[in-house]
């Protein structure tokens, strides 16, 4: 279930998945929530002088059992991902961090009168993920009242340093506050030739679009259907970007579908989950568990309640139908997407709804437990 | 056999091929020589073909292609299917074949020792399954006898994998968790043998499995030690000291 408690002066040992920099524990928790495998995190708010490079470190962790050994560490804050916390799941992060320089690739420097204007500038720029604003009291006159728009490969700062008279924050695109507007167009039989930032396997272009929307550097995508001539690229979703932020004109291509990220949408932003169940489709991946249930919808529910489950297969083969129901295979992968999709299986596949806002979860209040 | 390798001549001298001669002659099942006049196999091999006269039994061979019209074969004198076996359920999957003429034992054709009733709790670690069956689910009968080593799986664990069927104490399971090595179609009735205290023993009779070599779907075998009373009763009413038992 949903576990929102934070543990002060506690660090989880082992289970490391990835390490990033975040300005606070809440943002670290958010990053863990949206990471396909992260279940636990530890954030270093304070570090000894010799370990200043570890300060603001956000350590994302996984565990087969859902827990890890806790060790006492002054200045550390640990907690759980909010993967099963329904209404508390949001990519939007409005907090402003005074006295912090969130570093990344500075791709634009503009003069603005205040921090709000700077944040708005970032929110309305395709490439901007976070920003730093130098106040009028900043020690270097040439940077005073300057707004630095930044990005990185991970979408999070490459490092964070304390600095007087600097204020940092994140783009509010994920709060549906961008004024760029969002093209909803889906281009059938068309491919974008722009730069690939990543690729995942998806059952259709809509899942591809949702994944693009929540990928830090994806601005548009091209999805190759199951009929695509190159077998290794069937059901592959190419996440793309370009310098201009716009794709080059689409190339006519049979069995390809292209479209845009919906990150800059104000009303039609998708949820970070995929509710459709795909009949006759086999999502391959690492087996987590097998249960026997009555119906694909119950299998999806079981997957959703099993925090590590990312997707599932519900088999309708008579030999897979037991006394309690038919075989429900709960599965996972490194990136949260199937490792391969095949067709013609007797049954259905689908995704966990653990990141859906609509998933019921018990009301719980955040408790900081001093241990 | 899925995930196996070619056997050598005389390596598994108790292995026989049970073939049906209708319009043409085809290998259908395996079996094990347990006495000069006795072969032990699976009851389900005879579903739909319970007629002794259409069966031909070949021992002492490595390749099915060796069999010609001139190859000597044994015929069935008596077919004893376990009285509790029901085609519609699949338990008690064991049958005895009494041969019309006794076999001559050679280096390539000799019996396998049977376990004793006391071996029902013996822990076996070196077990092998052999047969001419398919090497994949949608495969074909193999020419050269295949062999594969395979670990035994506790019945409780096996039951979890096959919730819809009762894995009872008259069954024994074998397979790797990740799959990849297993018996398959055409291996039915053949031996699961284990080397224990320096001698090979017939521990199981290939019975069934969900597919072949699938992950988390072990092969299910008829547990021979559980049927020793039945085997002795059926064979010794015919001839005394007919069998090779481990305690002999």
């Amino acid at each position: 279930g949903c576990m929102t408690q934070l543990y002060k002066n506690t660090f989880f040992r082992g289970g490391d998945l990835a390490a990033i920099y975040t300005p606070d524990a809440q943002y670290c928790q958010k990053m863990c929530t949206f990471h396909p495998r992260c279940l636990l995190f530890s954030f270093l708010a304070v570090t000894p002088p010799k370990e200043t490079n570890k300060r603001f470190g956000c350590f994302m962790k996984e565990s087969i059992t859902g827990t890890l050994p806790r060790i006492h560490r002054t200045g550390a804050i640990s907690g759980h991902s909010l993967k099963q916390c329904g209404h508390q799941i949001s990519a939007c992060h409005r907090d402003i961090y005074k006295g912090l320089d969130m570093r990344g690739s500075n791709f634009n420097i503009s003069k603005t009168d205040n921090i709000e204007e700077c944040q708005k500038l970032c929110t309305n720029n395709f490439h901007c993920q976070f920003f730093t604003y130098a106040t009028s009291a900043f020690y270097r006159p040439e940077y005073r009242k300057k707004c630095l728009l930044k990005h990185s490969a991970s979408g999070t700062p490459t490092s964070i340093k304390s600095a007087d008279n600097l204020v940092s924050g994140f783009s509010l695109k994920s709060c549906a506050l961008s004024e760029i507007g969002c093209p909803m167009d889906i281009f059938q039989h068309s491919a974008f030739a722009d730069l690939n930032v990543s690729q995942v396997i998806t059952p259709d272009a809509f899942v591809c679009r949702t994944i693009c929307t929540f990928h830090p550097n994806c601005l548009f995508f091209t999805f190759y259907t199951n009929e695509w001539e190159t077998e290794s690229q069937r059901n592959v979703c190419f996440l793309k970007t370009s310098k201009s932020g716009r794709p080059s004109p689409p190339i006519p291509q049979e069995n390809a579908i292209s479209g845009y990220s919906l990150l800059t949408c104000r009303k039609t932003r998708p949820e970070p989950c995929h509710s459709k169940i795909y009949s006759g489709v086999d999502f391959e991946g690492e087996e987590l568990n097998v249960t026997f249930v009555q119906g694909a919808d119950v299998c999806q529910e079981t997957c959703t309640k099993t925090i590590r489950c990312q997707f599932f297969i519900y088999s309708l083969l008579p030999q897979d139908c037991k006394e309690e129901g038919c075989k429900c295979s709960l599965r996972l992968s490194t990136d949260g997407s199937p490792t391969r999709i095949t067709y013609g299986m007797q049954g259905s596949s689908g995704y966990s709804l653990r990141l859906c806002k609509l998933v019921d979860s018990p009301d719980c209040t955040t408790k900081i437990n001093a241990r | 056999i899925v995930g196996g390798t070619n056997a050598s001549l005389g390596e598994w001298p108790w292995q026989v091929s049970l073939q049906v001669k209708l319009v043409s002659q085809t290998h259908l099942c395996g079996g094990s020589i347990i006495g000069r006049q006795w072969v032990l196999t699976a009851a389900h091999c005879f579903d739909g073909i319970p007629y002794p006269d259409v069966w031909r039994i070949y021992g002492g061979i490595l390749s099915l292609s060796e069999i010609t019209k001139e190859t000597p074969s044994s015929r069935i004198k008596e077919l004893i299917i376990h009285q509790e076996y029901k085609v519609s359920e699949g338990n008690y999957d064991i049958a005895l074949i009494k041969l019309q003429t006794p076999l001559n034992y050679t280096e390539f054709q000799k019996p396998i020792c049977l376990p004793s009733k006391a071996d029902t709790n013996t822990i076996y670690t070196n077990c092998w399954v052999t047969g001419w069956g398919y090497t994949k689910e949608q495969g074909e009968t193999q020419n050269i006898l295949q062999k594969a080593t395979i670990p035994l799986v506790p019945n409780e664990e096996c039951q979890k994998k096959y919730r819809d069927y009762v894995i009872n104490k008259q069954m024994i399971c074998a397979g790797y968790k990740e799959g990849g090595t297993d018996a398959c179609k055409g291996d039915s009735g053949g031996p699961l043998v284990c080397k224990h205290s320096g001698r090979w023993q017939l521990v199981g009779i290939t019975s069934w499995g969900e597919g072949c070599g699938r992950k988390d779907q072990p092969g299910v075998y008829t547990k021979v030690s559980e049927y020793m009373d039945w085997i002795l009763e059926k064979t010794q009413s015919s001839d005394v000291r007919a069998l090779e038992t481990s305690s002999a």
């Epitope: - | 519609s88 359920e89 291996d187 039915s188």
Partner: antibody, heavy 125, light 107 residues
Framework: EVQLLESGGGLVQPGGSLRLSCAAS????????MTWVRQAPGKGLEWVSY????????IYADSVKGRFTISRDNSKNTLYLQMNSLRAEDTAVYYC??????????????????WGQGTLVTVSS | DIQMTQSPSFLSASVGDRVTITCRAS??????LAWYQQKPGKAPKLLIY???TLQSGVPSRFSGSGSGTEFTLTISSLQPEDFATYYC?????????FGGGTKVEIK
């Protein structure tokens, strides 16, 4: 000797309900999956529903899902089919059958080895 | 759903003839196929299961073969009591489906 005997068929108006029964004898009823199959007049066979040995699991054809309910009473050796919201296209002879699950070529396999004589259901106004 | 296509739909034959009925599955069903015989006003009767295994008590003139998508039922020498309708059925996946039937009539 295995015997299956259906009853409960008859004439019913569209939208009406009917409950079919199938009395089983000659085998251990609680060990077997059971199924219903129907055959419209002059037409082929159509599988309707299945139920596991204990009654814990059921599967239906799309054409009857939400309207028909299969159940069993192992103490009475009886299989049931509750049919609600009946339509003209449900007119058929309904057969109950036993699902055997034996071994063939080293696989478990299913087939309908014994059938009842059938009961006619006519849905008409 | 898996479609089962039987051919021919009708077949006229004489006593003693060798008769072959074909059943094609819209996708692979391994050997999960059964054949049934039905006479007018009677319930179907199981002939063959697992594509090729003869049900106990069924005469050996009936035989089945095939695997995957193509299956055949053969009656080696047609007898007067064999004039009936024959159905194939896949038991590979739910919903379980039957072929449309083949009616074997006297020529």
């Amino acid at each position: 000797e295995v015997q299956l005997l259906e009853s409960g068929g008859g004439l019913v108006q569209p939208g009406g309900s009917l409950r079919l029964s199938c009395a089983a004898s000659g085998f251990t009823f609680s060990h077997y999956l059971m199924t219903w199959v129907r055959q419209a007049p002059g037409k082929g066979l159509e599988w309707v529903s299945y139920i596991s040995p204990s009654g814990g699991h059921t599967i239906y054809a799309d054409s009857v899902k939400g309207r028909f309910t299969i159940s069993r009473d192992n103490s009475k050796n009886t299989l049931y089919l509750q049919m609600n919201s009946l339509r003209a296209e449900d007119t058929a002879v309904y057969y109950c059958a036993r699902v055997a699950r034996g071994i063939a070529a080293r696989s478990r396999t299913s087939y309908f080895d014994y059938w009842g004589q059938g009961t006619l259901v006519t849905v008409s106004s | 759903d898996i479609q089962m296509t039987q051919s021919p739909s009708f077949l006229s034959a004489s006593v003693g003839d060798r008769v072959t009925i074909t059943c094609r599955a819209s996708q692979g069903i391994s050997s999960y196929l059964a054949w049934y015989q039905q006479k007018p006003g009677k319930a179907p009767k199981l002939l063959i299961y697992a594509a090729s295994t003869l049900q106990s008590g069924v005469p050996s003139r009936f035989s089945g073969s095939g695997s995957g998508t193509e299956f055949t039922l053969t009656i080696s020498s047609l007898q007067p009591e064999d004039f009936a309708t024959y159905y194939c059925q896949q038991l590979n996946s739910y919903p379980l489906t039957f072929g449309g039937g083949t009616k074997v009539e006297i020529k």
